[in-house]
């Protein structure tokens, strides 16, 4: 996110992506914000409200069940990732309101904008873990009966979090505050010190590990899962299909603009018109990616309503039904409806 880029040899241009730049004005000089920034602020506000409340509710519902229910462990970890990211939003919001001025210091600059990337990696790795769990339940039910337990689920989550932290380190390390003078302000961004190769490498790794590879593997994984469950009369459910597709698709849909603009900007000359256009859209792309942090509770509630007929239950009990039902491996090696529905709930989009 926020970054520096020297759009021509020398001009202090703040671009919000992953480079440091100089030849366009460091910031718009108008008192009014640009339209993409206004849209980003609206999205941030909505995401913050829905994300904090929704994920707090999910954490509350799943925390009690996480000792014994594996699905609750998955949803708890996903909600924690989303909740953490949402906590950075008031700061990011304030910075955009102040035309990207960053009065919060160097430590905050390194940590807070990196949270969305931590969320991206944590979510996609947790999603991959959940998908592996779903896959094993369908194709290796006997193994699951013997080895699938809460302890293993927690270990898998710990590994996912550890890898996510590791993958976030490059952005964290390159993130710096920079004082600007015309106009006077402090900017928070990523400084690759004119090393375009390093910038491209970070962008490519982010695209491949955080988007393309998961997209490929999860598409294959869910194709197999859905083909198997679809072929069994007892588990044929358009609801299941819809929810699983919604959950996995949400991650890729909302991260797509950020990933595309990020990779394009790393290959474009900072003085090019396309770069400058993409640069103006950056806050909007970040805010769009942030929708991932509030979409899961919405999907859970919509799924819950669908499975319950109408919203007759209280929100917590509805969520409890959706998030804490345990997948039972039957001797028939097929799922019960509830198992498939639970699986559908959220194989979480990162």
């Amino acid at each position: 996110m926020n970054s520096f880029n020297y759009t021509t040899p020398d001009y202090g241009h703040y671009d919000d992506k992953d480079t440091l730049d100089l030849n366009t004005p460091v910031d718009k000089t108008s008192n009014t914000l640009r339209v993409p920034d206004i849209l980003a602020l609206v999205i941030f506000a909505v995401v913050f409200l829905v994300g904090v409340l929704g994920n707090a509710l999910v954490v509350w519902v799943t925390a009690f069940e996480a000792k014994r229910t594996i699905n609750a462990i998955w949803f708890l970890n996903l909600a924690v990732a989303d909740f953490l990211s949402c906590l950075a939003l008031p700061i990011l919001f304030t910075s955009i309101v102040q035309h990207h001025h960053w009065p919060f210091g160097g430590a905050a600059c390194s940590i807070l904008p990196s949270l969305i990337l931590l969320n991206m990696y944590a979510s996609i790795l947790l999603l991959a873990t959940i998908s592996a769990d779903r896959f094993l339940l369908v194709f290796k039910p006997i193994w699951c009966q013997n080895f699938r337990g809460a302890g293993l689920a927690w270990i898998a989550c710990a590994v996912a979090w550890g890898l996510a932290l590791l993958l976030t380190i490059p952005s964290f390390l390159y993130r710096v505050v920079r004082e600007e003078y015309f106009p006077p302000k402090v900017l928070c961004g990523v400084d690759y010190s004119h090393d375009k190769r390093r910038e491209r490498a970070v962008a490519i790794v982010r695209l491949v590990l955080g988007f393309l590879w998961p997209l490929l593997t999860l598409t294959i994984c869910y194709t197999f899962i859905l083909l198997r469950t679809w072929s069994r009369r007892a588990t044929r459910s358009t609801k299941t299909l819809k929810v699983v597709v919604a959950v996995v698709a949400s991650f890729f849909i909302f991260w797509l603009p950020y990933q595309v603009t990020g990779i394009m900007m790393s290959f474009l000359e900072p003085s090019s018109p396309t770069f400058l256009l993409l640069n103006k859209l950056d806050s909007l792309c970040v805010s769009f990616a942030y929708i991932n942090c509030c979409i899961n509770p919405i999907i859970y509630v919509v799924a819950g309503q669908g499975f319950q007929g109408r919203l007759r239950k209280s929100l917590p009990s509805l969520l409890r039904n959706v998030l804490t039902e345990e997948s039972v491996v039957r001797e028939s090696k097929s799922f019960t409806r509830s198992t498939v529905d639970t699986m559908a709930q959220k194989t979480q989009a990162v």
């Epitope: 000089t29 008192n31 004082e179 003078y181 015309f182 106009p183 006077p184």
Partner: antibody, heavy 116, light 107 residues
Framework: DVQLQESGPGLVKPSQSLSLTCTVT?????????WNWIRQFPGNKLEWMGY???????SYNPSLKSRISITRDTSKNQFFLQFYSVTTEDTARYYC?????????WGQGTTLTVSS | DIQMTQSPSSLSASLGEKVSLTCRAS??????LSWLQQKPDGSIKRLIY???TLDSGVPKRFSGSRSGSVYSLTISSLESEDFADYYC?????????FGGGTKLEIR
């Protein structure tokens, strides 16, 4: 109190190179702010030339970029303006100034005359 | 680059008189404007920054204001040391640019 003092050769011939020095007292050039060069032509027109920031980041006026360079010596608390291949058009009074919120402190200026 | 058009280019006034100098920006500069005073010996001093904020040590008779893209420096009651050259400067983006200056002379 922050004080800036320019010094330079005064008179140079066209196509020669030169260096102007700004010595800062009462403030470290590595603490914060940007340290600028500005010139004033005989007709009184002022032109910003460029700066070196406290962190060493440099920015130039695009119209001058290929002909100047700004450097510093932190041990002496000085920064410099190097001029390559001067012309008579570069005859002016050269000021160094600190930028934090606009240019808040200025030197007295040093006159440079380019003449054969 | 943003053009700063300063007027008048010269002005004659008497001691105790009230005078106003104006500066018009060719683009929005959002109040990122300073007023500078240059004495006959060439020394330059900042009087006002952020369009209307007085620098410390600057007499209260100096004031800055803004109306849209037009910025003004007003001296409420001229004193002998005020006769000098005045420049406006924007620092809203790169490169910062200066007005052409106003020469304030004793009538």
């Amino acid at each position: 109190d922050v004080q800036l003092q320019e010094s330079g050769p005064g008179l140079v011939k066209p196509s020669q190179s030169l260096s102007l020095t700004c010595t800062v007292t009462g403030y470290s050039i590595t603490s914060d702010s940007a340290w600028n060069w500005i010139r004033q032509f005989p007709g009184n027109k002022l032109e910003w030339m460029g700066y070196i920031s406290y962190s060493g980041r440099i920015s130039y006026n695009p119209s001058l970029k290929s002909r100047i360079s700004i450097t510093r010596d932190t041990s002496k608390n000085q920064f410099f303006l190097q001029f390559y291949s001067v012309t008579t058009e570069d005859t002016a009074r050269y000021y160094c100034a600190r930028a934090s919120i606009g240019f808040d402190y200025w030197g007295q200026g040093t006159t440079l005359t380019v003449s054969s | 680059d943003i053009q700063m058009t300063q007027s008048p280019s010269s002005l004659s006034a008497s001691l105790g008189e009230k005078v106003s100098l104006t500066c018009r920006a060719s683009q929005e500069i959002s109040g990122y404007l300073s007023w500078l005073q240059q004495k006959p010996d060439g020394s330059i001093k900042r009087l006002i920054y952020a369009a209307s904020t007085l620098d410390s040590g600057v007499p209260k008779r100096f004031s800055g204001s803004r109306s849209g893209s037009v910025y003004s420096l007003t001296i409420s009651s001229l004193e002998s040391e005020d006769f000098a050259d005045y420049y406006c400067l924007h620092y809203a983006n790169y490169p910062p640019t200066f007005g052409g200056g106003t020469k304030l002379e004793i009538r």
